[in-house]
């Protein structure tokens, strides 16, 4: 699996998550988020510069799981990538 990283962007808060998703040699076509304890995936919205955002009416519950589809057709899923108590500006890589 090529290297993937998730950077929590400025502006993220308990009801808004903005994540820059980088995938070695590829670009995200679709990113989905799943909160801790949930079975359902929700679509994130693509912003500028590879930043994907999600807005919630209720406080978001981490750690956060992601699945994505890239422009080249790669599909992957990563559990517990961004911790519940994340740091703005921090870059998280899936645990190996």
């Amino acid at each position: 699996v090529p290297k993937v990283t998730f950077t929590v962007e400025k502006g993220s808060n308990e009801k808004h998550l903005a994540v820059l998703v980088k995938y070695e040699g590829d670009t995200m076509a679709e990113v989905e988020l799943r909160e801790h304890g949930s079975d359902e995936w929700v679509a994130m919205t693509k912003g500028e510069g590879g930043v994907w955002t999600f807005d919630s009416e209720e406080p978001l519950q981490g750690p956060f799981n992601f699945r994505f589809l890239t422009e080249k057709g790669m599909k992957n899923v990563f559990d517990d990538v961004v911790p519940e108590k994340y740091t703005i500006g921090a870059t998280y890589a899936p645990e190996e």
Partner: antibody, heavy 114, light 105 residues
Framework: LESGPGLVKPSQTLSLTCTVS??????????WSWVRQPPGKGLEWIGN???????YYNPSLKSRITMSVDTSKNHFSLRLTSVTAADTAVYYC??????????WGQGTLVTVSS | ELTQSPSSLSASVGDRVTITCRAR??????LNWYQQKPGKAPKLLIW???NLQSGVPSRFSGSGSGTEFTLTISNLQFEDFASYYC?????????FGSGTKLEIK
């Protein structure tokens, strides 16, 4: 590649292991899955596990199943307790990319009989 | 829950056949199709409703979104006689349809 006993007695525990080749479970990016198929019937999803140990189980089987993963041996396992004849099936292990089941083992027949 | 129809279907080489899968509630486009031949493991054909898996012949196509999905095989070939299953990945709790057995008329 699935491995385990082909015959299990009623009320006992079915244990299967799937050894993954061609990649490391530890590298992430996938769920590791079990699916079964009773003779002449359709496919039934049993559950998924992530390399960290997170599990997702079929609600109808949840009380009887345990999935685990051993990254050092690059394998994952299934335990199904209190088996009956209804658990007789071909058991498949598979890889899921979060969207599909894109790679499957060849399957192993487990018969529950005394 | 996924409801697949028909449960069995007879057709001839060269025919065009359609198999339907219905979801109880919307699953967006997170619906996959698999082919299974006797004694073999299932094989992924179509992912996310309409995307052809690499190596699968173009006579297979999928469509639909929400609650209704179809798998179409045009110009049926002898090797296409098999069982077909739909599967949803809208949630982490996957489910399969009950299957469709495609037989030679």
């Amino acid at each position: 590649l699935e491995s385990g006993p082909g015959l299990v007695k009623p009320s006992q525990t079915l244990s299967l292991t799937c050894t993954v080749s061609g990649g490391s479970i530890r590298s992430g990016g996938y769920y590791w899955s079990w699916v079964r198929q009773p003779p002449g019937k359709g496919l039934e999803w049993i559950g998924n596990i992530y390399h960290s140990g997170n599990t997702y189980y079929n609600p109808s089987l949840k009380s009887r199943i345990t999935m685990s993963v051993d990254t050092s041996k690059n394998h994952f396992s299934l335990r199904l307790t209190s088996v009956t004849a209804a658990d007789t099936a071909v058991y498949y292990c598979a890889r899921s990319d979060g969207y599909t089941l894109d790679n499957w083992g060849q399957g192993t027949l487990v018969t529950v009989s005394s | 829950e996924l409801t697949q129809s028909p449960s069995s279907l007879s057709a001839s080489v060269g025919d065009r056949v359609t198999i339907t899968c219905r979801a109880r509630q919307s699953i967006s486009t997170y619906l996959n199709w698999y082919q299974q031949k006797p004694g073999k493991a299932p094989k992924l054909l179509i992912w996310s409703a309409s995307n052809l898996q690499s190596g699968v012949p173009s006579r297979f196509s999928g469509s639909g979104s929400g609650t209704e999905f179809t798998l179409t095989i045009s110009n049926l070939q002898f090797e296409d006689f098999a069982s077909y299953y739909c599967q949803q990945s809208y949630t982490t709790l996957y489910t399969f349809g009950s299957g469709t057995k495609l037989e030679i008329k």
